[in-house]
């Protein structure tokens, strides 16, 4: 407890060039008699910023009316802030002395520093797609912020990630800083609709962090599963064979049918459907003419997905004697 306390609540004040800075100072007592002055710095070389009694301070205004009775607020505003204004500001109470005023009590000081907001985070994914169960790296970059202290977090679908490395440059003093962070993300088969978020929190953002996003759809390749089936019913002298290409992403897909190793040029009917998880299904039908078929027909459904090596599924056609009889009956 003290007779008089000088309260400067902010240890650090971040200001932007061209704006107005408010430096707060309140006193707990109006005694002893004497003025409150503002200085930048300490010691004999300190610079007088404001004196309520005398001097000309065109950029400085008081928050309260200092001539008002019982005023205990000696806060000031400094307009048109420039880089030259940075430093630590002290409000200092003087008491009337004989013959001149004597410094009585100083506030703890408020450091004024130039603050700059970070740029919107930019998130970049891998150059090439990767399949589930593998790890991909995402980078997040933000620039131009000051002071250096900054917090960066990664999220995948709202869940915070822990496997990442962050660097803030430069390490020494600078007017502005940059942050770069690399997160390692294990892909899941259902990640087509997933998002990674890079969140940057900085004192200049007043609790409203900046976010950058990337869609895992740009980074993931879900390879298809193939199934070739023969429909039990035949249409005239033709048997319907289905190739089902399931759960693939992206949509880019080439499908070809081969009959005993010979690529078939004729068109087939097909449908493309999208699944809830963002992957696709492709169904292709191939009609095989069985009127002149031998027993050893092998059909192959070959799929080339997203420029990858082709995968294929074979089906040895089962044509029963009964079917052949039906066929020869149907064909004169």
């Amino acid at each position: 407890e003290e007779e008089l306390q000088m309260i400067q609540p902010e240890k650090l004040l971040l200001v932007t060039v061209g704006k107005t800075a408010t430096l707060h100072c309140t006193v707990t007592s109006l005694l002893p008699v004497g003025p409150v002055l503002w200085f930048r710095g300490v010691g004999p070389g300190r610079e007088l910023i404001y004196n309520q009694k005398e001097g000309h301070f065109p950029r400085v205004t008081t928050v309260s009316d200092l001539t008002k009775r019982n005023n205990m607020d000696f806060s000031i505003r400094i307009s048109s802030i420039t880089p030259a204004d940075v430093g630590t500001y002290y409000c200092v109470k003087f008491r009337k002395g004989s013959p001149e005023n004597v410094e009585f009590k100083s506030g703890p000081g408020t450091e004024m520093a130039l603050g700059a907001k970070p740029s919107a985070p930019v998130v970049l994914g891998p150059a090439a797609r990767t399949t589930p169960e593998h790890t991909v790296s995402f980078t997040c970059e933000s620039h131009g912020f000051s002071p250096r202290d900054i917090t960066l977090k990664w999220f995948k679908n709202g869940n915070e990630l822990s496997d990442f490395q962050t660097n803030v440059d430069p390490t020494g003093q600078s007017v502005a800083y940059s942050i770069r962070s690399t997160a390692r993300v294990v892909l899941d088969p259902w990640d087509v609709r997933s998002q990674v978020i890079c969140e940057v929190a900085h004192v200049t953002l007043q609790g409203d962090p900046l976010r950058g996003t990337a869609n895992l759809s740009e980074a993931i390749r879900v390879p298809p599963t193939l199934e070739v089936t023969q429909q039990p019913m035949r249409v005239g002298n033709q048997v319907n064979v289905t190739c089902q290409v399931r759960k693939f992403y992206p949509q880019s897909l080439q499908l070809t049918w081969s009959e005993n190793g010979n690529v078939c040029q004729r068109e087939t009917a097909s449908t493309l459907t999208e699944n809830k998880d963002g992957t696709y299904n492709w169904t292709s039908w191939f009609l095989v003419n069985i009127s002149d078929q031998r027993d050893d027909v092998v059909l192959t459904c070959q799929v080339k997905h997203d420029g990858q090596l082709a995968v294929s599924k074979r089906l040895a056609l089962e044509v029963t004697v009964h079917q052949k009889d039906q066929s020869s009956d149907a064909t004169p």
Partner: antibody, heavy 114, light 111 residues
Framework: EVQLEESGPGLVAPSQSLSITCTVS????????VNWVRQPPGKGLEWLGI???????DYNSALKSRLSISKDNSKSQVFLKMNSLQSDDTARYYC????????WGQGTSVTVSS | DIVLTQSPASLAVSLGQGATISCRAS??????????MHWYQQKPGQPPKPLIY???NLESGVPARFSGSGSRTDFTLTIDPVEADDAATYYC?????????FGGGTKLEIK
């Protein structure tokens, strides 16, 4: 609880010096100033001087030449020393806390007589 | 030195009535927007007790019957209504300029 207590000799011979101690409790002498005020019998109050928290002093100019105020922060004591006492220095001497004089001691009576 | 002149030197007031004490300074005691004038009550055999600081602010624990007003050179202490316990001598004091000075005192008697 804030308390101040003065202790002095009671009787001082003319031309001799006076030493009074004010012992305080409930506050720190580094944070508060202490005043000395006297009151002659049946008369009004007269401010003698103050010692501030930082140890600096201000005196009543009429008495400055024979007045000295000092303190010992660690012992929570303030000292008043007055030289060349005369009969008109007979008074009750009080110590009071700070510029606001919000707390007073009960005072110590000093009589200047041979 | 700033001379503080109190008037009247003594006054007698009936119980429940109002009492007004004046304090006039030989020069202004105002600085930095405030009046550095204070009021004390002293009863026989006791030290002074602070009542009002900075002309109009009531000290903690002091009844609201006491009030202070004024600025620059003219100040007033008002007690309304007066109670039997208010019988005492009242002093004004300035600490705007060294040496700090007290008024000569006003003795209040209750009828």
């Amino acid at each position: 609880e804030v308390q101040l207590e003065e202790s002095g000799p009671g009787l001082v011979a003319p031309s001799q010096s006076l030493s009074i101690t004010c012992t305080v409790s409930g506050f720190s002498l580094t944070g508060y100033g202490v005043n000395w005020v006297r009151q002659p019998p049946g008369k009004g109050l007269e401010w003698l001087g103050i010692i501030w928290g930082d140890g600096s002093t201000d005196y009543n100019s009429a008495l400055k030449s024979r007045l000295s105020i000092s303190k010992d922060n660690s012992k929570s004591q303030v000292f008043l020393k007055m030289n060349s006492l005369q009969s008109d220095d007979t008074a009750r001497y009080y110590c009071a806390r700070a510029g606001k004089m919000d707390y007073w001691g009960q005072g110590t009576s000093v009589t200047v007589s041979s | 030195d700033i001379v503080l002149t109190q008037s009247p030197a003594s006054l007698a007031v009936s119980l429940g009535q109002g009492a007004t004490i004046s304090c006039r300074a030989s020069e202004s005691v105002d600085s930095y927007g405030n009046s550095f004038m204070h009021w004390y009550q002293q009863k026989p055999g006791q030290p002074p007790k602070p009542l009002i600081y900075l002309a109009s602010n009531l000290e903690s624990g002091v009844p609201a019957r006491f009030s202070g007003s004024g600025s620059r050179t003219d100040f007033t202490l008002t007690i309304d209504p007066v109670e039997a316990d208010d019988a005492a001598t009242y002093y004004c004091q300035q600490n705007n300029e060294y040496p700090w000075t007290f008024g000569g005192g006003t003795k209040l008697e209750i009828k």
